[in-house]
C-alpha cells in the first residue's frame, strides 16, 4: 500500500493504492547538497548523477571509522524521497548530487557557498530547464550564506531548505532564514509537528510551510535494495523539492514567487495542532502542510496572496518592524500586531522603489509585528493614498480616486500613544466600499491598485460583545487582500490574514468590560481578477 507520506501529499482525486501523480517532474533537474550517496541503489540508479563536487570538513574524533553505508545514508535517503522509483515524490525528476556534508553529517558554510557557486557556474555553462536546489541542512544564522541563496534565487533557481531540527525559531538558522528560500518544517502522519528526541521541527515566520517528515520510507545505503525510515525537516524539504519539480515540469515558466504562492495555496490548511509550538510563535507559524495541486494546469486564473510577517520590532518606544514582499509580488495591504496592544499602527511606504509594510511600537509596548499581504497581480499599478489626521468628529477618510483603481487594503498610523482607548467608535458610512476610514487622530493609508479585470469588495463581521478574536473570510473564488479592524473598536491587538480569513485580535476579554467599547469589527477586502480567469479559459 502507498506510504502515508505520499498519500498525504496526493490530492483526493489522484488517491489510489498506488502513488501515480500526473506528471513526474521530468523537465526539472534537482541539485542535492548533502552527504555522498549510493548512486547504484536501484531506487535511484540512473536518476541521480554524482558530480565531482566535494567540499567537506574532516570527521571529528580519532576513533571515527568511515563506513561507506553510513557516509551515504542521509543523501541516499533524500535522493530517494525526491525522485525514487518506488518511494519518491517526483519519479521523473533527474538529480545531481554535491557532497557538502561529511560522514558525520557535518559541513561548513564555506563548503556550501562553494557548492552553490558550482551550481551557478554549471547553470551558466549549460543552461537546462528549471532548476531546484535542495539544501537539507541547517546551521547557525549566516548572512553570507543567506546572501548566496538570494543571488541564486534571483538567477531563477528555486531553493528549498530544511527548517532545522532544533525545536526553535527557524529565523535563527541558515539557510532557513533566507527569505528567498522555501523553508520547510516537518509534520507526522497525524499532521502534528515532528518531535525528534527532546527536540523537533523548527517553526516561526521563516517557515513557509510544513511537509511529511516523520517515519519516511526511502532508499537505504545499507544495500542496493534496502529501504529505511528516517525523520526530520530534511525529509520534509525533500517532499517539497519533489512537489516543486512536478509543478515546474507542468509549468516550466513559473517564477519562484509564483511557485511559492502555489505551494502555499494548494497546501492543507489549519490541520496542525499549534499547541505544540511556543505560544509566542503560534501566530507566526504557517498552519500549512504541502500537497500536490489537484491539477497541474489551470491554476493561473487565481489571484494568489500570502501573508508575510516581519521580525519583532523590539520594545523601544520608537521601534519599528518592516515586512517585505518578494520582488515579483505586490504589497496589497499592511497591518500590524502587538501582544500588549500598545502600538501606533502601520503604514505602507516606498523603500528602494518598492512598497514595504512598516509597523510602529508605542511607549510601554513590548514590540510590534508588521504583516504584509503579498500577492501575484500581473500588470498591476499600485499606489498608496494617505489622508493626514482629520481632527474632525467623523474621523479620517481616504479613498481611491483614480479611475479604474480599486481598494485592496487599509492601514492606519497614529502618533498619540494610546489611540482609541477612550474614544467612541466611528462608524464607516455604508455604500462607500472604496474608502478607508479611521480615527480622527490617525493618518489613513489606502492601497489602490489598477490591474486588468481586478475587482474588490469589502466584507465586515462585527461582534457587539467583547471577543478575543473576530474573523471574516472571503468567499470561494475571492482572495483576501486586506485585513483590518474597524476604527473605534478598542483594545485591538492587531489584525492579520490567515489564508483567506481576516483575523482581528483583542485583549483578553476578562480585562475588558462588556461596554460598547468592547465591540470588535473585522474588515476584509476580498478581490478577484476576471482578467486572469478569462485568460485561463482561453488556454484550456
Amino acid at each position: 500500500s502507498i506510504p502515508w507520506n505520499l498519500e498525504r501529499i496526493t490530492p483526493p482525486r489522484y488517491r489510489a493504492d498506488e502513488y501515480q501523480p500526473p506528471d513526474g517532474g521530468s523537465l526539472v533537474e534537482v541539485y542535492l547538497l548533502d552527504t555522498s550517496i549510493q548512486s547504484d541503489h536501484r531506487e535511484i540508479e540512473g536518476r541521480v548523477m554524482v558530480t565531482d563536487f566535494e567540499n567537506v570538513p574532516e570527521e571529528d574524533g580519532t576513533r571515527f571509522h568511515r563506513q561507506a553505508s553510513k557516509c551515504d545514508s542521509h543523501g541516499t535517503h533524500l535522493a530517494g524521497v525526491v525522485s525514487g522509483r518506488d518511494a519518491g515524490v517526483a519519479k521523473g525528476a533527474s538529480m545531481r548530487s554535491l557532497r557538502v556534508l561529511n560522514c558525520q553529517g557535518k559541513g561548513t558554510v564555506s563548503g556550501t557557498l562553494i557548492g552553490l557557486e558550482f551550481i551557478r557556474k554549471s547553470q551558466l555553462v549549460q543552461p537546462v530547464g528549471p532548476l531546484v536546489v535542495l539544501l537539507p541542512l541547517a546551521g547557525g544564522y549566516s548572512r553570507v550564506l543567506n546572501a548566496a541563496c538570494q543571488r541564486l534565487a534571483r538567477a531563477g533557481v528555486v531553493l528549498v531548505t530544511a527548517a532545522g531540527n532544533f525545536r526553535d525559531d527557524a529565523c535563527l538558522y541558515s539557510p532557513a532564514s533566507a527569505p528567498e528560500v522555501i523553508t520547510v518544517g516537518a509534520t507526522n502522519a497525524q499532521d502534528q509537528p515532528v518531535t525528534l528526541g527532546t527536540l523537533g521541527t523548527n517553526f516561526g515566520r521563516c517557515v513557509d510551510l510544513f511537509a511529511p517528515g516523520e517515519d519516511i520510507i526511502g532508499a537505504s545505503s545499507d544495500c542496493s535494495t534496502c529501504f529505511v525510515s528516517q525523520s526530520g525537516t530534511s525529509q520534509a524539504a525533500a517532499h517539497v523539492a519533489g512537489i516543486a519539480a512536478m509543478m515546474l515540469s507542468a509549468e516550466p515558466e513559473l517564477t519562484l514567487a509564483e511557485l511559492r504562492q502555489r505551494l502555499i495555496h494548494f497546501s492543507a490548511k489549519d490541520v496542525i495542532n499549534e499547541a505544540w509550538f511556543p505560544e509566542d510563535q503560534r501566530v507566526l507559524t504557517p498552519n500549512l502542510v504541502a500537497a500536490l495541486p489537484p491539477s497541474t494546469h489551470g491554476a493561473g486564473w487565481q489571484l494568489f496572496c500570502r501573508t508575510v510577517w516581519s521580525a519583532h520590532s523590539g520594545p523601544t518606544r520608537m521601534a519599528t518592524a518592516v515586512a517585505r514582499c518578494a520582488p515579483d509580488e505586490e504589497l496589497l495591504s499592511c497591518s500590524s500586531f502587538s501582544r500588549s496592544g500598545k502600538r501606533r499602527g502601520e503604514r505602507m511606504e516606498a523603500q528602494g522603489g518598492k512598497l514595504v509594510c512598516r509597523a510602529h511600537n508605542a511607549f510601554g509596548g513590548e514590540g510590534v509585528y508588521a504583516i504584509a499581504r503579498c500577492c501575484l497581480l500581473p500588470q498591476a499599478n499600485c499606489s498608496v493614498h494617505t489622508a493626514p489626521p482629520a481632527e474632525a468628529s467623523m474621523g479620517t477618510r481616504v479613498h481611491c480616486h483614480q479611475q479604474g483603481h480599486v481598494l485592496t487594503g487599509c492601514s492606519s498610523h497614529w502618533e498619540v500613544e494610546d489611540l482609541g482607548t477612550h474614544k467612541p467608535p466611528v462608524l464607516r458610512p455604508r455604500g462607500q466600499p472604496n474608502q478607508c476610514v479611521g480615527h480622527r487622530e490617525a493618518s489613513i493609508h489606502a492601497s489602490c491598485c489598477h490591474a486588468p479585470g481586478l475587482e474588490c469588495k469589502v466584507k465586515e463581521h462585527g461582534i457587539p460583545a467583547p471577543q478575543e478574536q473576530v474573523t471574516v473570510a472571503c468567499e470561494e473564488g475571492w482572495t483576501l487582500t486586506g485585513c483590518s479592524a474597524l476604527p473605534g473598536t478598542s483594545h485591538v491587538l492587531g489584525a492579520y490574514a490567515v489564508d483567506n480569513t481576516c483575523v482581528v485580535r483583542s485583549r483578553d476579554v476578562s480585562t475588558t468590560g462588556s461596554t460598547s467599547e468592547g465591540a470588535v469589527t473585522a474588515v476584509a477586502i476580498c478581490c478577484r481578477s476576471r482578467h486572469l480567469a478569462q485568460a485561463s479559459q482561453e488556454l484550456q
Epitope: 498506488e18 522509483r85 542496493s224
Partner: antibody, heavy 119, light 113 residues
C-alpha cells in the same frame, strides 16, 4: 486478480533471434519491477536481470550482461526478454516475476516459457 | 556476488514429521538500519513456477500454511516444515535480495520417506 502471463513455448535454431513476453494485469504495472529467471533442465534458479517499466531502468546479472536484452512496453503492461543470436545452451525454462521496491522479493511469478534451441 | 549454499541437497522425511532445510550466505544479509534479513524462501513443485513462502527470513506470505516457518539471521537461515504433508513434496530455494546480482541457493529436494 494479480497475474503475469507469459508467451508460449518456442523452438528455435541456433543463431536465430527470439523475444518472449510477460504481460502483467491486476496491478499497476509501472510501479513494480519485473525480473527474469532462468531454469535450465534439471537445474536451479538463476536471476538474469530486471526492469522497472515506469522508466525502463534495467539491471543485469554480470553473467547475462550482453547476452540478452530486457525491455518493456508500459502502454500494454508487457515486459520482454530477447536474444539476438540463440545458442543451444540457452535451452531452458524462463520465468518472469514481479517485486516491489521496498518489498524486493518475488511475490508473483509467470507460468514460464520453455525455450528449446536445437539444430 | 553473495553465494547462497543450501544443505542438504535432498531430504526424505516421513509424513507428519519435521523437515529442516538450511541456507548459508557468504556474507550477512542483515542490515542494521531497518534490522531486516533480506532473505526469502520459495517452493517449486514439478512443472510449476516457484511460489513465495517466506520473506524477511521469517515472515510467512499470506495463504501459506503455518506449518512453514523461517528463522535465522545474518548468514545462517532455516526453513522448517513442522509436519510434512504429501503436497509439500517440492524443491525449496533460498534467495538473497539485498545485493545485485540476486542469487539463489542450489535448491533442496524434499521427498516422502
Amino acid at each position: 486478480q494479480v497475474q503475469l502471463v507469459q508467451s508460449g513455448a518456442e523452438v528455435k535454431k541456433p543463431g536465430e533471434s527470439l523475444k518472449i513476453s510477460c504481460k502483467g494485469s491486476g496491478y499497476s504495472f509501472t510501479n513494480y519491477y519485473i525480473s527474469w529467471v532462468r531454469q535450465m533442465p534439471g537445474k536451479g534458479l538463476e536471476w538474469m536481470g530486471l526492469i522497472y517499466p515506469g522508466d525502463s531502468y534495467t539491471r543485469y546479472s554480470p553473467r547475462f550482461q550482453g547476452q540478452v536484452t530486457i525491455s518493456a512496453d508500459k502502454s500494454i503492461s508487457t515486459a520482454y526478454l530477447q536474444w539476438s543470436s540463440l545458442k543451444a545452451s540457452d535451452t531452458a525454462m524462463y520465468y518472469c516475476a514481479r517485486d516491489h521496491g521496498y518489498k524486493p522479493y518475488s511475490d508473483i511469478w509467470g507460468q514460464g516459457t520453455l525455450v528449446t534451441v536445437s539444430s | 556476488d553473495i553465494v547462497m549454499t543450501q544443505s542438504p541437497d535432498s531430504l526424505a522425511v516421513s509424513l507428519g514429521e519435521r523437515a529442516t532445510i538450511n541456507c548459508r550466505s557468504s556474507q550477512s544479509v542483515l542490515y542494521s538500519s531497518n534490522n531486516k534479513n533480506y532473505l526469502a524462501w520459495y517452493q517449486q513443485k514439478p512443472g510449476q513456477p516457484p511460489k513465495l513462502l517466506i520473506y524477511w527470513a521469517s515472515t510467512r506470505e499470506s495463504g501459506v500454511p503455518d506449518r512453514f516457518s523461517g528463522s535465522g539471521s545474518g548468514t545462517d537461515f532455516t526453513l522448517t516444515i513442522s509436519s510434512l504433508q504429501a503436497e509439500d513434496v517440492a524443491v525449496y530455494y533460498c534467495q538473497q535480495y539485498s545485493s545485485f546480482p540476486i542469487t539463489f541457493g542450489q535448491g533442496t529436494k524434499v521427498e516422502i520417506k
